[in-house]
């Protein structure tokens, strides 16, 4: 059954479309049968994730002492007021170039498990969401975004790094996630190219046109290098961009300085923003699991959010992400996503009940996973 | 040291214009966005405009739009505010602040300096 | 008339606690806009005191403390002494204004 697009205000796993012919080919990306230069390779060729290049390039995040209250950059020069750390303005969680780690791409060489060996992992991302399939766990309870309103000095850096558009987010961001808090470092978003999806998450076979992830990390860990392959030391909030009828003023405020960062390793700098605008509205409704960065070095303990309401664009702002920027190699940045991983047993849990009355197939016989959380 | 040092204040007629400079040290200045701030006497608080750390990008309060210029000269580590069309209201203790702080709070501010507009 | 509103004077005796509040609206302090407070000598630099809502800059006694609640925060000052007399300042940022906003300030007197 054709899974029904979803719309702002309707769930992943909203009521089953009427329609009674299967989920054609024309559906389903081809890239994991037919990997051509620019298309995502498959398990083996394994791209990934984040600008979060090899351990020794990853920012070196330190939580400041109580008293300070936010993030401290070990690399960065600070500026000393009258015996007080200042931020300096743009360069939270700068990250290093030049690493081995630095040299993979989507499609093509060098296989990924060749530039580090977690991206043959058995617990990878992304998936492939099966709402019906999704264990619904009560304990998940509403997410809580803590000072993500920005203003909007200072400004923030918006670059292009050759495999995705990043925006480094400043010290202070902080997210609950069940007991744990933790710091949010950077946002960054994946797409396909003109009339090809993007996303790396898929629902039921379905792609989306493009996906946000905002990567965090847990305040149970001092440094990204630490935190690396430890379940629950890196937290991703993943929402899926979807094509409405009106523009989005929150990503306008990216999507508007695109051609300033076209070329490969080119950055400017945005006015600070919401950068919870960037997310959906409805943070009480949502599918967790534990996956790994979807690039290298793919290091796995990584906690997936994947947000059930997607976030609408105009035609012309998913146009403009997919046709505006250049990678490696003068070839446009596009189709930068990864192929879905199995799930190796894995269950997805849903912080509400979808696999009820959610799916095309509601009406056979489903095996529910169960919750594996417990207490409230 | 970190320190904002101000110049320029004085007093002048109504309709006249002045230049506040804000001199820096002991910090990056060309990394930090900056702000005036003032206070008109037995008044609170008012902030006034502020500056992106290119000098790019400006803001200006409803009540000073069009009429004040807010700039920079990273070389020199030097903010200016330009202040032409000066009103009566417009006489208070100018401010330069550093916008260093991501949260939106002033971390570092200048000694202030005295602006009267009087015929 | 500020955007935020404090209390025009608060008082106390040496060693009391006192608090001082900052009213806003849903597009500063009610968005999710952070809150910052400063301690203001007249005729001096202002000095930042909290920012991000509760945190404090080194330096600043831990007898000061600050928090945020919907549109409004506020400011603690326990064991208050003869050298905190003077004025406080809240701020934050206002979408609708697009511009950094103050509130009208509050005289904290020691009394005795």
């Known amino acids: 059954q054709r899974l029904p697009r979803m719309q702002e205000d309707s769930p992943l796993g909203g009521g089953s479309s009427g329609e009674d012919d299967p989920l054609g080919e024309e559906d389903l990306p081809s890239e994991e049968d037919s990997p051509r230069e620019e298309d995502p390779p498959g398990e083996e060729d394994l791209p990934g994730e984040e600008d979060l290049p090899g351990e020794e390039d990853l920012p070196e995040v330190k939580p400041k002492s109580e008293e300070e209250g936010s993030l401290k950059l070990e690399d960065l020069p600070t500026v000393e007021a009258p015996g007080d750390p200042q931020e300096p303005q743009n360069n939270a969680h700068r990250d290093k170039e030049g690493d081995d780690q630095s040299h993979w791409r989507y499609g093509g060489d060098p296989p990924w498990p060749r530039v580090s060996p977690a991206c043959a992992g058995r617990f990878q991302s992304p998936v492939d969401i099966r709402p019906q399939l999704a264990a619904f766990c009560p304990a998940l309870r509403p997410l809580e975004l803590l000072g993500f309103q920005l203003p909007p000095l200072p400004e923030l850096r918006l670059r292009n790094n050759g495999h995705s558009v990043q925006l480094t987010l400043p010290p202070g961001l902080e997210m609950a996630l069940g007991p744990g808090r933790e710091y949010a470092l950077q946002l960054h978003l994946h797409w396909g190219a003109a009339g090809r999806p993007g996303s790396e998450h898929t629902v039921e076979g379905h792609r989306f046109p493009a996906e946000i992830h905002v990567v965090h990390l847990s305040t149970a860990f001092a440094r990204v290098d630490e935190a690396l392959g430890r379940p629950g030391g890196l937290a991703v909030l993943a929402a899926f961009l979807e094509e409405g009828p009106e523009e989005n003023s929150a990503y306008e405020q990216l999507l508007s300085r695109l051609e300033e960062i076209a070329e490969e390793g080119s950055e400017t700098q945005v006015p600070g923003l919401d950068i919870s605008a960037l997310l959906p509205s409805d943070f009480s409704r949502y599918f967790q699991y534990e996956g790994s960065l979807t690039t290298p070095p793919c290091a796995q303990g990584v906690i997936w959010t994947v947000f059930n309401q997607t976030v609408m664009l105009s035609a012309k702002q998913l146009h403009t992400l997919s046709d505006t920027l250049w990678g490696p190699g003068d070839s446009r940045l596009q189709l930068n996503f990864r192929a879905t991983q199995p799930l190796n047993g894995r269950v997805i849990e849903a912080s509400f009940p979808a696999g009820v009355d959610s799916s095309p197939r509601a009406a056979e016989p489903v095996q529910l996973n169960s919750c594996l959380a417990a207490g409230d | 040291q970190v320190q904002l040092v101000q110049s320029g204040g004085g007093v002048v007629q109504p309709g006249g214009s002045l230049r506040l400079s804000c001199a820096a040290s002991?910090?990056?200045?060309?990394?930090?966005?900056m702000s005036w701030v003032r206070q008109a006497p037995g008044k609170g608080l008012e902030w006034v405009s502020a500056i992106s750390a290119n000098g790019g990008t400006t803001y200006y309060a409803d009540s000073v739009k069009g009429r004040f210029t807010i700039s920079r000269d990273n070389s020199k580590n030097t903010l200016y505010l330009q202040m032409n069309s000066l009103r009566a209201e417009d006489t208070a203790v100018y401010y330069c602040?550093?916008?260093?702080?991501?949260?939106?709070?002033?971390?570092?501010w200048g000694q202030g300096t005295m602006v009267t507009v009087s015929s | 008339q500020s955007v935020l509103t404090q209390p025009p004077s608060v008082s106390g005796a040496p060693g009391q606690r006192v608090t001082i509040s900052c009213t806003g609206s849903?597009?500063?302090?009610?968005?999710?806009?952070?809150v910052h407070w400063y301690q203001h000598l007249p005729g001096t630099a202002p000095k930042l005191l909290i920012y991000g809502n509760s945190n404090r800059p080194s330096g600043v006694p831990d007898r000061f403390s600050g928090s945020k609640s919907g549109t409004s925060a506020s400011l603690a000052i326990t064991g208050l002494q003869a050298e905190d007399e003077t004025d406080y300042f809240c701020?934050?940022?206002?979408?609708?204004?697009?511009?950094?906003?103050f509130g009208g300030g509050t005289k904290v007197t020691v009394l005795g």
């Open positions: 602040a550093n916008n260093g702080n991501y949260r939106g709070a002033f971390d570092i």
């Open positions: 701020q934050s940022y206002d979408s609708s204004l697009s511009a950094w906003v």
């Open positions: 849903s597009s500063n302090i009610g968005a999710g806009y952070d």
């Open positions: 002991g910090f990056p200045f060309s990394s930090y966005a």
